[in-house]
Interface confidence: low
C-alpha cells in the first residue's frame, strides 16, 4: 500500500490530464483526489498511465467507494477494469447493457477472465433472465458463452432470445444444455414455415427427441451428416430405415462412412438387416 | 452425484465363466445420455476396454474378446452385468464398470474390484 | 483397430516441472482424444476429454491439445498429487483403446 504522504506544493491536480503520467505513484496518491478522479473517470483512458499508476488510482477509488463503486464510475473504468479482481467486482450493480458492453470491449480478443464471468454473473442476475440484448451483447463478445452456462442457468433464457444465437454459438454445447435449449428454440421458430424453420432449428437438433425427428423426416429438409451425428442417440434408435431415409435425403450416403460411430452404428443395430439393405449402402447390422 | 459399485466372486477357476455387476446409485441407467462399460487392468499393465450397453440393451464389444463377453442391463434394478466365458490365467485383472458419456469419455468409475483365475 | 502409442513411457519430475506427455493414434481420429490419470489402488480419473477440453473440477494447469493422430497432455507446473500414470483414449472407432500409459515419477 502506498504512503501517506502531503502532496509538494504547487502539484495539487486540479483536473485529470496528461500531466499527471510524470507523478509518482505516493504523488499520484497524495495529489489527486477521489472524488474529482470518479467524477473524470472517461478521461483515464486517453492517458497513457503505467500498470504501477493505475494501481494508485484503483487503491483511491477503493477507499472512496469501499461498498464498490457506482454504475457511473463502472462505465468509464476502461482499462483501469483489468485491474479488478472478481471480489471488487461482486459488489458492483450493474444495470445497463451500455456499461456491460463498455468493459467487454478492453478484453474484447481474450478469452473470458475470472473478473468478466463474475461481471456477466452479475449483470445477468440483476435483470433476472437472460434477455435477447444481452444475449446478442455476450455471443458477439464471446461466441462460447450459452454453452458455458449449466442447464439450470440455461432454463431462464426466455424463447425471445433464442432469436439472438447463432450456429456457432452452440459449438460446444453438450446434450444437457441442448435438451434445455431445444423446447425453447422450437417455441421460438413454431410459426416458421418448412424450409425456413428446419434452417433455424437444426443447430438446436441435438435436444431433438424421437417424434420431432420423425416429424422432419416428413417435410423433405435433406439434414446433413454433421447434423445427425450431433442427435440424441436415445433419440435416432427409435427411427425406422425409411425415416433415417428421408431425413438424410440424398445425405444418406454418408451414413457408410460414419458406420462405425455412434450414434449410426447404435442405429444400425437395432435395424434389420433386409432393411438396411434397401440402403443399397453394403451398412451390416 | 453418481457413483458406480462393482460385485461379483473375487476367485474363478479356469475355463468357468466369470460374472460381475455394476450398481448405479445417484443416477438412472435408463439416461438416454450415457454409455455403461466395463473396462479391465491386468497387474501392472494397461487398461483394455471390454464393451458397453445402451439402456435400450444395444451393446458394443471390443473385437478381441467379442466371442466370449456378454453384457446385459437391468433397468428395474439400475444395474447392468459383465459375463465373460472360458476365462484363463490372462483374464486375471481388476474389472471397472464405468459411466461414458456421447463425447466417448468415461467420466465416472467404480472402485474396481479384483479378479483371479486361478484353480 | 486403431493404436494408441504413448510416450515416454515414464519419466521423472520435479515440482514446478512443466511436464509434457505426447499419445500418437495409427489413424486420423479427428479430436476424438481422452486422458486419464491414475493413482495406484485407484481407479483412473477422466482429466481431458475431446482432446483439449478439461472436464469439470481438474485444475486449470491440465491442458491437452492436437487433432489428427498427434495429440499433447501438458501439466504446466507439476504438483505432489500429479505423480501417477497418465492415459490416452480413443473413443473414434468402436475398439476404444487406450495408450500404453506414461508414469510420471519424483525426480
Known amino acids: 500500500e502506498v504512503e501517506k504522504t502531503a502532496c509538494p506544493s504547487g502539484k495539487k491536480a486540479r483536473e485529470i490530464d496528461e500531466s499527471l503520467i510524470f507523478y509518482k505513484k505516493w504523488e499520484l496518491e497524495a495529489c489527486v483526489d477521489a472524488a474529482l478522479l470518479a467524477t473524470q473517470m472517461d478521461r483515464v483512458n486517453a492517458i497513457p498511465f503505467t500498470y504501477e499508476q493505475l494501481d494508485v488510482l484503483k487503491h483511491k477509488l477503493d477507499e472512496l467507494y469501499p461498498q464498490g463503486y457506482p454504475e457511473s464510475v463502472i462505465q468509464h473504468l476502461g482499462y483501469l477494469f483489468l485491474k479488478m479482481s472478481p471480489e471488487d467486482i461482486r459488489k458492483w450493480n450493474v444495470t445497463s447493457l451500455e456499461t456491460l458492453k463498455a468493459l467487454l470491449e478492453v478484453n474484447k480478443g481474450h478469452e473470458m477472465s475470472p473478473q468478466v464471468a463474475t461481471l456477466i454473473d452479475r449483470f445477468v442476475k440483476g435483470r433476472g433472465q437472460l434477455d435477447k440484448d444481452t444475449l446478442d451483447t455476450l455471443t458477439a463478445f464471446y461466441p462460447g458463452y450459452l454453452c458455458s452456462l449449466s442447464p439450470e442457468e440455461l432454463s431462464s433464457v426466455p424463447p425471445s432470445s433464442i432469436w439472438a444465437v447463432r450456429p456457432q454459438d452452440l459449438d460446444t454445447c453438450d446434450p444437457r444444455q441442448l435438451d434445455v435449449l431445444y423446447p425453447k428454440a422450437r417455441l421460438a421458430f413454431q410459426n416458421m414455415n418448412g424450409s425456413e424453420y428446419f434452417v433455424k432449428i437444426q443447430s438446436f437438433l441435438g435436444g431433438a427427441p424421437t417424434e420431432d425427428l420423425k416429424a422432419l423426416s416428413q417435410q423433405n429438409v435433406s439434414m446433413d451428416l454433421a447434423t445427425f451425428m450431433k442427435l440424441r442417440t436415445d433419440a435416432v434408435l427409435p427411427l425406422t430405415v425409411a425415416e433415417v431415409q428421408k431425413l438424410l435425403g440424398p445425405h444418406v450416403e454418408g451414413l457408410k462412412a460414419e458406420e462405425r460411430h455412434r450414434p449410426v452404428r447404435d442405429w444400425i443395430l437395432r435395424q434389420r438387416q433386409d432393411d438396411l439393405d434397401t440402403l443399397g449402402l453394403g451398412l451390416q447390422g | 452425484q453418481v457413483q458406480l459399485q462393482e460385485s461379483g466372486p473375487g476367485l474363478v477357476k479356469p475355463s468357468e465363466t466369470l460374472s460381475l455387476t455394476c450398481t448405479v446409485s445417484g443416477g438412472s441407467v435408463s439416461s438416454g445420455s450415457y454409455y455403461w462399460s466395463w473396462i479391465r487392468q491386468p497387474p501392472g499393465k494397461g487398461l483394455e476396454w471390454i464393451g458397453y450397453?445402451?439402456?435400450?440393451?444395444?451393446?458394443n464389444y471390443n473385437p478381441s474378446l467379442k466371442s466370449r463377453v456378454t453384457i446385459s442391463v437391468d433397468t428395474s434394478k439400475n444395474q447392468f452385468s459383465l459375463k465373460l466365458s472360458s476365462v484363463t490365467a490372462a483374464d486375471t485383472a481388476v474389472y471397472y464398470c464405468a459411466r461414458e458419456g456421447k463425447n466417448g469419455a468415461f467420466d465416472i468409475w467404480g472402485q474396481g474390484t479384483m479378479v483371479t483365475v486361478s484353480s | 483397430d486403431i493404436q494408441m502409442t504413448q510416450s515416454p513411457s515414464s519419466l521423472s519430475a520435479s515440482v514446478g516441472d512443466r511436464v509434457t506427455i505426447t499419445c500418437r493414434a495409427s489413424q486420423s481420429i479427428s479430436s476424438y482424444l481422452n486422458w486419464y490419470q491414475q493413482k495406484p489402488g485407484k481407479a483412473p480419473k477422466l482429466l481431458i476429454y475431446a482432446a483439449s477440453s478439461l472436464q469439470s473440477g481438474v485444475p486449470s494447469r491440465f491442458s491437452g491439445s492436437g487433432s489428427g493422430t498427434d495429440f499433447t497432455l501438458t501439466i504446466s507446473s507439476l504438483q505432489p498429487e500429479d505423480f501417477a500414470t497418465y492415459y490416452c483414449q480413443q473413443p473414434y472407432d468402436a475398439s476404444y483403446t487406450f495408450g500404453g500409459g506414461t508414469k510420471v515419477e519424483i525426480k
Open positions: 450397453i445402451y439402456y435400450s440393451g444395444s451393446t
